[in-house]
């Protein structure tokens, strides 16, 4: 790479003569960071992105740049800044030494720092029989709306955009931010530079193998001709698109990220910036067989993040490793030995392995989806990808055990019509990120901003756990999961739903003195019971099991152990109905569920009783899962019986809206 | 707007060689390669091939192997198809067309070959 | 290479006629056809693309149908512009190839 330093010297003269005395310290009581990927071959020391504080107009974030480096040249250190931001997060890409950070850290406005690091495309005609539904034959694929009213965006390597399979359907921006290739002998073949992004754009809008046939896509060269790129040059295409968006808005946007690179802090916050402006994210969970939530972009809740599976609908292994999985990942999709385009030739196909692969099909069911309802949130998006997906076919014994709970057995499918979903009340369950083992830690789990947290359970692998609350935050209500004494750990789990117009609130019972155990009820005129949680301070609640369970005609109860706070999620929105649903064992048995019927949407899973032996409560779908301790190591057949407890709810409201449409 | 410009009427001896141009504009020629479709008098349409803007690569009908050329010159978006050996049957209008989906066409080039 | 037949290979039609021009391919070609017109000593003109999508600016009086092997265009009024000679081509496969063509003339 020919040094771009040559006018370094020009540029610090300049600002030596610049004016320069200005505070140092950063304003009180704030300590910027400075962050670096925890994977250190991927690593790009030397060049920083410096993010400002959130409200830091253009004009400062330049004056900032100019302070650090008439600061550096005053020290003697030579820097350039790259790239100023703005748009999405405001800052500034600089090249510099590393000794210079701790100055960096103390300039007015800086929220942070980090350092760039590389990212990697995530690639190594079943796929369309799998996500079409039924009454379609793949032979014959051609969806109802090709995507047309949407544009997808595609951050990747250069693409042959006059292939057959894309031609007239890609616009090749100039937008390009890559990194030199490694190596002195590396030789740049065109048809290799363009097989990542041209593979990936037949998989989204191929004529003949593509998901969404009418979509149009725009495509932004991230990745080099090696398939790498930076997490500086993705953040500046991110900015390109928020920037074109403003420009000359259309209609809704899709941006495929098909590339993942170690967790970032920055990215992740612009994949949130570009998500709240109405944008849909998709990107690959990673190659890495690894947890999904130690990569960025995936780890962004904002962003859809979608693992691969074969034909069989396992997870996909490559080579040694394979398809990311957890908590993380919002869905799985095709992608392994995938049909697109190739580059060697205008009309020529291969076969690609990867979540890359993975996330350009559900690129196109997204596109697909957004065709057919323009005005779907991305929080509405999500819902119904998760909705329509085939569940439980994926065999979990594939991911470490630590991991089965929390991987999403979900496998993306198009809608069997692309309208007519609206009546329906749809949950998705989130996990936290494990709470680490201290006597007090905690856990949270979060729903997206335009969704509601209609109910809150925990899950502790130990069995040592003290339940979990629902408590406002921010103005919004998260779900928190507590630890115990001796514990390894809990996970919050929160029941996040679509319900316009809900009005939520959340009523709590302190441990009850007599020996009934704890109840609460929504008092309110109109407010129904969505979800139960139980709390306590005592590290183990014994055994005690309350004599009834829940009076009869008083559907809107929660019941819970006398020595726990219990807490009822009550809701009122037009139409919304539930009813509580019991399914108790009397023997111990590891795991007890109970589903909610046809028509009716899970939005609460709580244990009764409360006990250590159980290790938690969790949603997966429309069942509520009820986990205890091995059956081996509980003591007697009395305290074994449990009994789980599901909230079933359906909106009348929302099934009349549907049949006006219709 | 979408424009493919060709160039004039040819009159060629029975063993000689052509070479027509079709010089485009009003889009981005990168995203499409051009198609030769050419028309003998009285007759019907017949595809000849595809050649790209991007990277040269090039795809001829078999009836064409090795006796015709596609090339393109990005830097004048132009692209030219090279017929040698020519015989009489190869009297024809020569068209060019925008892709493979060959949405918007040249006005024709009209190729006489006669001794 | 797929074989392209249209039929009727000429028609005469009066000012306000429907017309009705098919086209039959040797092999399934999906909903890959597309129909041009051409007038003497001009280029052909797309008309309708995959089947039965019409570019904007083509009138709506030419509609396209069908898939698998039989297709048709339809011309629901006819105009005075519109006598002219109308190719099918299938774009299934390389190499694409065309009908023989529907000459339409004036009664």
């Known amino acids: 790479q020919e040094d771009e330093d040559g006018d370094y010297e020009e540029l610090v003269l300049a600002l030596r003569s610049e004016e320069d005395g200005l505070a140092e310290a950063p304003e009180h009581g704030t300590t910027a960071t400075f962050h670096r990927c925890a994977k250190d071959p991927w690593r790009l020391p030397g060049t920083y992105v410096v993010v400002l504080k959130e409200e830091t107009h253009l004009s400062q974030s330049e004056r900032t740049a100019r302070r650090l480096q008439a600061q550096a040249a005053r020290r003697g250190y030579l820097t350039k800044i790259l790239h100023v931001f703005h748009g999405l997060l405001p800052g500034f890409l600089v090249k510099m030494s590393g000794d210079l950070l701790e100055l960096a850290l103390k300039l007015p406005h800086v929220d942070y720092i980090e350092e760039d690091s590389s990212v990697f495309a995530q690639s190594i005609p079943w796929n369309l029989e799998r996500i079409t539904p039924p009454r379609y034959r793949a032979d014959e694929y051609q969806p109802p709306d090709g995507g047309s009213l949407v544009e997808v965006y595609l951050l990747d390597t250069s693409i042959q955009s006059d292939h057959r399979e894309i031609e007239g359907r890609v616009m090749v921006t100039d937008f390009e931010n890559v990194p030199e290739e490694d190596g002195t002998r590396f030789h740049r073949q065109a048809s290799k530079c363009d097989s990542h992004g041209t593979h990936l754009a037949g998989v989204v809008s191929g004529r003949d193998a593509g998901v969404a046939k009418g979509a149009s896509m725009r495509s932004l060269r991230v990745l080099n001709c090696q398939g790498k790129g930076t997490v500086s040059g993705t953040l500046i295409g991110l900015e390109f698109i928020r920037k074109s968006q403003l420009v000359q808005p259309v209609g809704p946007l899709v941006v495929l990220l098909p590339l993942a690179g170690g967790y970032s802090r920055v990215l992740n916050a612009a994949c949130q910036r570009l998500a709240r402006a109405g944008v849909v994210l998709v990107t690959a969970a990673g190659n890495f067989r690894d947890d999904a939530c130690l990569y960025s972009p995936a780890s962004a809740p904002e962003v859809i993040t979608v693992g691969a599976t074969n034909a069989q609908d396992q997870p996909v292994t490559l080579g040694t490793l394979g398809t990311n999985f957890g908590r993380c990942v919002d869905l799985f999709a095709p992608g392994e030995d995938i049909i697109g385009a190739s580059s060697d030739c205008s009309t020529c196909f291969v076969s690609q392995s990867g979540t890359s692969q993975a996330a350009a099909h559900v690129a196109g069911i997204a596109a697909m989806m957004l065709s057919a309802e323009p005005e779907l949130t991305l929080a509405e998006l999500r819902q119904r990808l998760i909705h329509f997906s085939a569940k439980d076919v994926i065999n979990e014994a594939w991911f470490p055990e630590d991991q089965r709970v929390l991987t999403p057995n979900l496998v993306a499918a198009l809608p069997p019509s692309t309208h007519g979903a609206g009546w329906q009340l749809f949950c998705r369950t989130v996990w936290s990120a494990h709470s680490g083992p201290t006597r007090m830690a905690t856990a949270v789990a979060r729903c997206a901003p335009d969704e509601e947290l209609l109910s809150c359970s925990s899950f502790s692998r130990s069995g040592k756990r003290r339940g979990e609350r629902m408590e406002a935050q921010g103005g919004k209500l998260v779900c928190r999961a507590h630890n115990a004494f001796g514990g390894e750990g809990v996970y919050a789990i929160a029941r996040c739903c679509l319900l316009p117009q809900a009005n939520c609130s959340v009523h709590t019972a302190p441990p009850a003195e007599a020996s009934m155990g704890t109840r609460v009820h929504c008092h309110q005129q109109g407010h129904v019971l969505t979800g139960c949680s139980s709390h306590w301070e005592v590290e183990d609640l014994g055994t005690h099991k309350p004599p009834v369970l829940r009076p009869r005609g008083q559907p809107n109860q929660c019941v819970g152990h006398r020595e726990a706070s219990i807490h009822a999620s009550c809701c009122h929105a037009p139409g919304l109905e539930c009813k509580v649903k019991e399914h108790g064992i009397p023997a111990p048995q590891e795991q007890v569920t109970v589903a909610c019927e046809e028509g009716w949407t899970l939005t609460g899973c709580s244990a009764l009783p409360g006990t250590s032996h159980v290790l938690g409560a969790y949603a997966v779908d429309n069942t509520c899962v009820v986990r205890s301790r091995d059956v081996s190591t509980t003591g007697s057949t009395s305290e074994g019986a449990v009994t789980a407890v599901a909230i079933c709810c359906r909106s009348r409201h929302l099934a009349q809206a549907s049949q006006e449409l219709q | 707007q979408v424009q493919l410009v060709q160039s004039g009427a040819e009159v060629k001896k029975p063993g000689a060689s052509v070479k027509v141009s079709c010089k485009a504009s009003?889009?981005?020629?990168?995203?499409?390669?051009i198609s030769w479709v050419r028309q003998a008098p009285g007759q019907g349409l017949e595809w000849m091939g595809w050649?790209?803007?991007?990277?040269?690569?090039?795809n001829y009908a078999q009836k064409l192997q090795g006796r015709g050329t596609m090339t393109t010159d990005p830097s004048t978006s132009t692209a030219y198809m090279e017929l040698r050996s020519l015989r009489s049957d190869d009297t024809a209008v020569y068209y060019c067309?925008?892709?493979?989906?060959?949405?918007?066409w040249g006005q024709g080039t009209t190729v006489t070959v006669s001794s | 290479d797929i074989q392209m037949t249209q039929s009727p290979s000429s028609l005469s039609a009066s000012v306000g006629d429907r017309v009705t021009i098919t086209c039959r391919a040797s092999?399934?070609?999906?909903?890959?056809l597309d129909w041009y017109q051409q007038k003497p000593g001009k280029a052909p003109k797309l008309l309708i693309y995959?089947?039965?999508t019409r570019p904007s600016g083509v009138p709506s009086r030419f509609s396209g149908s069908g898939s698998g092997t039989d297709f048709t265009l339809t011309i629901s009024s006819l105009q005075p512009e519109d006598f002219a000679t109308y190719y099918c081509q299938q774009d299934q496969d390389i190499p694409p190839t065309f009908g023989q063509g529907t000459k339409v003339e004036i009664k």
């Open positions: 067309a925008r892709g493979y989906v060959m949405d918007f």
């Open positions: 050649v790209s803007f991007y990277n040269g690569n090039t």
């Open positions: 092999q399934s070609i999906n909903n890959w």
């Open positions: 995959a089947a039965s």
């Open positions: 009003g889009y981005a020629i990168y995203n499409y390669g």
